[in-house]
């Protein structure tokens, strides 16, 4: 069962001092959204017992495993049902506390009633303030039964529930017809899913025989021990003032557990702490009584004394619950209350006993849950005890449950039950995940979801080349870390599988499904060097390089040229996809820019060493375009072009370039230089008659500038075919003067 306790402080003189605390002994409980799951929840449950709305209650978290509810302002705030929810996943458990008003008309003789399936439950409401009206019983907030006020027996109204079944569980209340619901007696009925002493899906399994008022859980057969007791069968008392499944918690305050109600997971319910009783858990046990609610009687024999917290304290020479067993009677010693083994293992179980006469090998036996009796294979006899060793046949899941070691001698007999948990080794449900790869290594995330039982103690990664029949290589890793598989072959597929283990012998699970992981190509090792470069324009650069000569095939798929523009902080990458290439033309560069240039060989996604860098300065871009270009036919073979100089020139123009093209023609255009840059007019000669031509021009300073607009003009007449255009130029002013 989940180690969850709801504590109610019942010192009710001042409701503002009232508090409820939920304490979890589960590992990592209440931490919220981390790996341990949801936090502890503590709240008032208004679904069944509704009370008038009041100020909101205050919830305070104290560390990771405790939560406290405060802020009660008036007694009516306390009345009703409170619940604490803790544990994660399938172990999520709700613990319920029902609070009754001490001033109610009717009070429960006993709040929590835990009964077995098929039993008769009797709820008893004691008259505290009499009213001569009907008494209405409700179940989970709905009408259930009516009693005439004359039907009270010894000042009590009884509700008999014969042959109860699990759906009968819930909150019951008894209310006088004309009274406020806050004056009701509230009860909690818990109906175990099985008959007395049985548990399991078909109620076929036998309970371990819980001691000291512990209640056998109908789902898992574990004893839910009263506060103040521990052990598989609740056989051991905690020190005074301690509680929790391992006695690890301590009652707050100087008066220990006085005035506290303890609520534990069903089917236990609620009770006072060990040594206390009464509706407010403030009365110490009467002599001869002990335990939670003082329900247990000591009946100590042989001079034993009754301790109200732990029961009989036996004098030397005696032991047993009532000090009824002489130390001469054989006694099982130091038997673990719980053992864990892995499925299909054949463990050895030891059982030690002492007594007079001394136990021998044949007097100690081991009984499995199905009733099979095992006899010991060997015994170690020491002066103070005999230890029998049992070789257990291969374990199956059905072996989970309560085993019993029994010793019998002529002096008497003793037995000790202990729980055996058969765990299923974990088996991965998925393949491991590839995180990164290189040519000779793979980085893998090995921990995947798994079937079977945790915790995971080790993770083994098995790998070998795909389609290989060689032995698997194995690496053992920490469950929480990623694994690097080293010294692999490049460009090779590897089959990779995970094997998980849990603690203990035989904890290794089956291998998980395989996955294919492929290493990268080998890194290219050759370093090219730059042979040279040639500027082919303000934005074009031709680069050439070489590689060292080495024997064997070239490891590479191509080259990567990188140009770094340090001024702008920009990198240009050019991919040359042939490993045979030794030259490349880079276009679209920025004129006037200083570039750092290098080249690298690449293979798959891997880059080899870069060449030593070269520094290249591209010439700046040319001047702006000439303005107002105009064409005028002079004859059947001549056209005059006029223009204006470009504006905002960065320097003196060295020449103009005119482009001549026959309109609609398919041939290349003709470029004609105008070498006298001061001129603004030129005559293009040698043109064909009656032919339409396109013209545009640009200036040059250190580099060619932008093209002007294109103009069209046709030559005159129908003269002879010319040899081709030529140019004659003069200043525009001269032409105008003429």
């Amino acid at each position: 069962a989940v180690d969850l306790t709801l504590l109610a402080n019942l010192r009710l003189t001042d409701p503002q001092r009232f508090f409820l605390t939920c304490v979890s002994g589960e590992a990592g409980a209440g931490r919220g959204s981390d790996a341990w799951g949801p936090p502890l929840l503590l709240e008032k449950d208004d679904r069944i017992v509704r009370t008038p709305p009041g100020p909101p209650l205050r919830l305070a978290r104290n560390g990771s495993h405790q939560v406290t509810l405060r802020g009660f302002s008036k007694p009516s705030d306390l009345v009703g049902v409170f619940s604490c929810v803790g544990g994660a996943g399938a172990r999520r458990t709700r613990v319920i506390y029902v609070h009754n008003s001490p001033g109610a008309h009717l009070l429960p003789d006993k709040v929590t009633h835990t009964v077995n399936k098929g039993d008769t439950a009797v709820l008893s409401a004691r008259v505290h303030k009499e009213k001569q009206t009907d008494v209405i019983w409700k179940s989970n907030g709905s009408y259930f039964y009516t009693l005439d006020w004359h039907e009270a027996q010894d000042g009590r109204f009884l509700l008999q529930l014969p042959n109860v079944q699990p759906p009968s569980s819930g909150i019951y209340s008894a209310t006088y017809l004309e009274a406020s619901p806050l004056g009701s007696a509230f009860f909690r009925l818990i109906v175990r899913g099985c008959g007395a002493g049985r548990w399991g899906p078909g109620c076929t399994k036998e309970c371990p025989g819980c001691l000291h008022g512990g209640v056998c859980h109908d789902h898992d057969g574990e004893c839910v021990c009263p506060p103040g007791f521990t052990g598989t069968r609740c056989e051991q008392a905690c020190r005074e003032g301690r509680f929790g499944q391992s006695c690890q918690e301590q009652c707050p305050g100087i008066s220990g557990c006085r005035g506290l109600t303890f609520c534990l997971p069903d089917p236990y319910g609620c009770s006072c702490g060990s040594g206390w009783r009464g509706s407010q858990c403030q009365e110490a046990c009467a002599p001869g009584h002990f335990g939670a609610d003082c329900r247990l009687q000591c009946q100590c024999q042989n001079g034993g004394t009754c301790d109200r917290f732990s029961g009989c304290v036996c004098p030397s020479g005696w032991h047993g619950v009532h000090c009824e067993k002489s130390d001469r009677i054989p006694q099982i010693l130091n038997m673990a209350s719980e053992l864990e083994f892995n499925l299909e293992t054949m463990p050895r179980i030891n059982c030690a006993a002492a007594g007079n006469p001394f136990p021998v090998r044949g007097s100690i036996e081991l009984r499995k849950p199905d009733g099979t009796v095992l006899l010991s294979t060997k015994a170690i006899v020491e002066p103070e005890k005999t230890t029998a060793e049992f070789e257990v046949p291969r374990l199956v899941l059905a072996d989970s449950g309560f085993w019993e070691c029994r010793v019998s001698t002529s002096g008497g007999q003793d037995s000790r039950r202990f729980k055996v948990n058969v765990k299923v080794p974990p088996v991965p449900l998925a393949a491991p995940r590839l995180l990164t790869k290189q040519s000779r290594q793979l980085v893998v995330s090995p921990l995947v979801s798994f079937s079977g039982d945790g915790p995971i103690s080790t993770v083994r990664l098995h790998y070998r080349p795909q389609d290989s029949t060689m032995d698997w290589s194995t690496i053992v890793v920490d469950p929480s870390e990623n694994v690097t598989l080293m010294n692999l072959r490049p460009k090779t597929g590897y089959s990779v599988r995970v094997q998980l283990s849990r603690p203990g012998e035989g904890g290794e699970g089956a291998w998980g499904p395989p996955t294919l992981m492929t290493t990268d190509c080998p890194e290219p090792l050759l370093q090219p060097w730059l042979e040279g470069w040639h500027v082919e324009g303000t934005d074009r650069l031709r680069v050439s390089w070489s590689l060292p000569l080495v024997p064997g095939p070239l490891v590479g798929d191509g080259f990567l040229l990188r140009l770094w523009d340090g001024t702008r902080g920009q990198e240009r990458r050019e991919n040359v996809s042939s490993p045979q290439a030794r030259t490349a033309l880079l276009t679209g560069l920025t004129p006037g820019t200083h570039y750092q240039l290098d080249v690298q060989l690449y293979h798959c996604t891997l880059l080899g060493p870069a060449s030593p860098p070269a520094h290249v300065l591209l010439p700046p871009s040319g001047p702006p375009a000439p303005r107002h270009l105009h064409a005028q036919a002079l004859s059947d073979s001549e056209i005059q072009l006029t223009w204006k100089h470009p504006e905002a020139l960065p320097g003196p123009i060295s020449k103009y370039v005119v482009e001549v093209q026959v309109a609609g023609g398919a041939g290349d255009p003709l470029w004609i230089d105008v070498d006298r840059p001061e001129e603004t007019s030129t005559i293009i000669r040698g043109l064909n008659a009656s032919t339409r031509y396109l013209f545009r021009m640009r200036a040059s300073i250190q580099g060619l500038g932008d093209w002007s607009n294109t103009v069209e003009e046709s030559t005159l007449g129908n003269g002879l075919q010319a040899e081709g255009p030529v140019q004659e130029s003069r200043a525009a002013e001269e032409g105008l003067d003429q």
């Epitope: 509704r50 009907d134 209405i136 009408y143 259930f144 009693l147 406020s180």
Partner: antibody, heavy 127, light 110 residues
């Protein structure tokens, strides 16, 4: 579905006896308080008798006290009204009804109401 | 036991509101004793309309409402409809084992 079915009515002479039955189904009869209510021809409703779930507590209208006896058999889910020393003024349609208790607001007391009625059985007392 | 006093008849036109009174004493209506109201159509069994003076069981129209002042309880039917034409009875308890009905009121929809 909750059903109440009265039977046993008929013509009887003054001073005679009659036993009415009310068969209940569709609910846990043994948990509910039950009542008999009658209605004389052309007149209003008149409460006759009440019985608690256990059968231990009963009550009667003054007009029938000492002559009528209410009882129940929870194992048979049946309510009875034994009518002795019948008079002409006992002529009426006799209804059995279930008492339910309602939780009006959740904060206040619970309140009763006759939530299911039978179709009635006619008792005629005449010579 | 004395019968609770109701008017013999009350009438109203469709859509109107009508109120039926039910007068008792401090032993019944005026005490902390639960008043309930029932509707009975001719030839049919009665049907619970209101319990604890003002509360409607599920399935009962919100047109029916109740109130109480002193020894008198009242049933109001708003937005009167033709199907509301029936006899109406109030009821109360006297102690735990004694009960009383009203004399009944015939409601006519004009």
């Amino acid at each position: 579905e909750v059903q109440l079915l009265e039977s046993g009515g008929g013509l009887v002479q003054p001073g005679g006896s009659l036993r009415l039955s009310c068969a209940a189904s569709g609910f846990t009869f043994s948990r509910y308080k039950m009542k008999w209510v009658r209605q004389a021809p052309g007149k209003g409703l008149e409460w006759v008798s009440v019985i608690y779930p256990s059968g231990g507590g009963t009550g009667y209208a003054d007009s029938v006290k000492g002559r009528f006896t209410i009882s129940r058999d929870n194992s048979k889910n049946t309510l009875y009204l034994q009518m002795n020393s019948l008079r002409a003024e006992d002529t009426a349609v006799y209804y059995c009804a279930r008492v339910n208790y309602y939780d009006s607001s959740g904060y206040g007391p619970i309140a009763p109401g006759l939530d299911y009625w039978g179709q009635g059985t006619l008792v005629t007392v005449s010579s | 036991q004395s019968v609770l006093t109701q008017p013999d008849s009350v009438s109203g036109s469709p859509g109107e509101s009508i109120t039926i009174s039910c007068t008792g004493s401090s032993r019944d209506v005026g005490g902390y004793n639960y008043v309930s109201w029932y509707q009975q159509h001719p030839g049919k069994a009665p049907k619970l309309l209101l319990y604890d003076v003002t509360y409607r069981p599920s399935g009962i129209s919100g047109r029916f409402s109740g109130s109480k002042s002193g020894d008198t309880a009242s049933l109001t039917i708003s937005g009167l409809r033709t199907e509301d034409e029936a006899d109406y009875y109030c009821s109360s308890s006297i102690g735990t084992r004694t009960y009383v009905f009203g004399s009944g009121t015939k409601v006519t929809v004009l």
